[in-house]
Amino acid sequence: QRINTEKETLPKPIIWAKPSIMVTNGNSVNIWCQGAQSASEYQLYFEGSFFALERPKPSRSMNKVRFFISQMTSHTAGIYTCFYQSGELWSKSSNPLKLVVTGLYDTPNLWVYPRPEVTLGENVTFFCQLKTATSKFFLLKERGSNHIQNKYGNIQAEFPMGPVTRAHRGTYRCFGSYNDYAWSFPSEPVTLLITGGVENSSLAPTDPTSSLDYWEFDLSTNESGLQKDSAFWDHTTQN
């Protein structure tokens, strides 16, 4: 097991997950750790505890390894980091990788007010309701940005989008969470359609909502942007 010493001078590895950092309960996920060609061992940590290790074979590429989680559960959802060893030196820790398990317990209802088809600039609010009491709700836009909207609420949360622009067009789903890494089943999708004339640039928000406060849960998992949310709903899109 890796020992903390002052010798940790090697650059930090990059960590990412495929097909997604959101994994349905019981499904598998691959965690990749990319270090150096000279690496003799990689170690994966989960919530600060030693999880797994891999000693790459010289016949294979040694600069990255794959850790396979065969069945994702609430017990394996959380924050992962990895390290690698080269010679006597250990690397610094990778950036944290946040793995979320979905498909737990219940399914929320999602609807949009005033209606799913609105005109440009109209105020729109999404509502997410889960009969099972939960502490936080998440709203995701499929193939959207790499941010998730979240709001605290007991049984219901509302997500005011402000005056909508064409950037708001798309399909949304919501989740209730039992903690930050254990989420409900996804709601049925709701598609927001925007009608109207030429878009007024003054209506365009700085981020895809009119308030940055709602966009807190950042999904990017490394500085190279290797993890995006384009495969949230299709676990076969990446190999």
Partner: nanobody, 126 residues
């Protein structure tokens, strides 16, 4: 569905040896990573040793040099050879499997394992 059945436990004197066996049902054994854990009375379950599908091994510091994990894919069995046994090795020993797995992954964290045996008791006393 994988079923794991441990055997070989018993009572032994300090300094003695035992070999635990874990027989796995099904055809998936060759694609499984295997591990041994133990739980002493009143304590949490702890990692002992693990072996990847490609025979890479890893041991807890407390058993390194005394215990050896091995596997026989033809017999669908994983072994834990225990020598120089101490009183603090007294525990129920559990065999666990990760099915399927990949390459040389060695799993140390108990929640990574998705199949568990019922356990076999090892008692070390004079």
């Amino acid at each position: 569905e994988v079923q794991l059945v441990e055997s070989g436990g018993g009572e032994v004197q300090p300094g003695g040896s035992l070999r635990l066996s874990c027989a796995a049902s099904g055809r998936t054994f060759a694609s499984a990573a295997m591990g041994w854990f133990r739980q002493a009375p009143g304590k949490e379950r702890e990692f002992v040793a693990a072996i990847s599908r490609s025979d890479d091994t890893y041991y807890a510091d407390s058993v390194k040099g005394r215990f050896t994990i091995s596997r026989d894919n033809a017999k669908n069995t994983v072994y834990l050879q225990m020598s120089s046994l101490r009183a603090e090795d007294t525990a129920v020993y559990y065999c666990a499997a990760v099915v399927p797995t990949y390459g040389s992954n060695i799993y140390v964290y108990s929640a990574a394992y998705n199949y568990w045996g019922q356990g076999t008791l090892v008692t070390v006393k004079p």
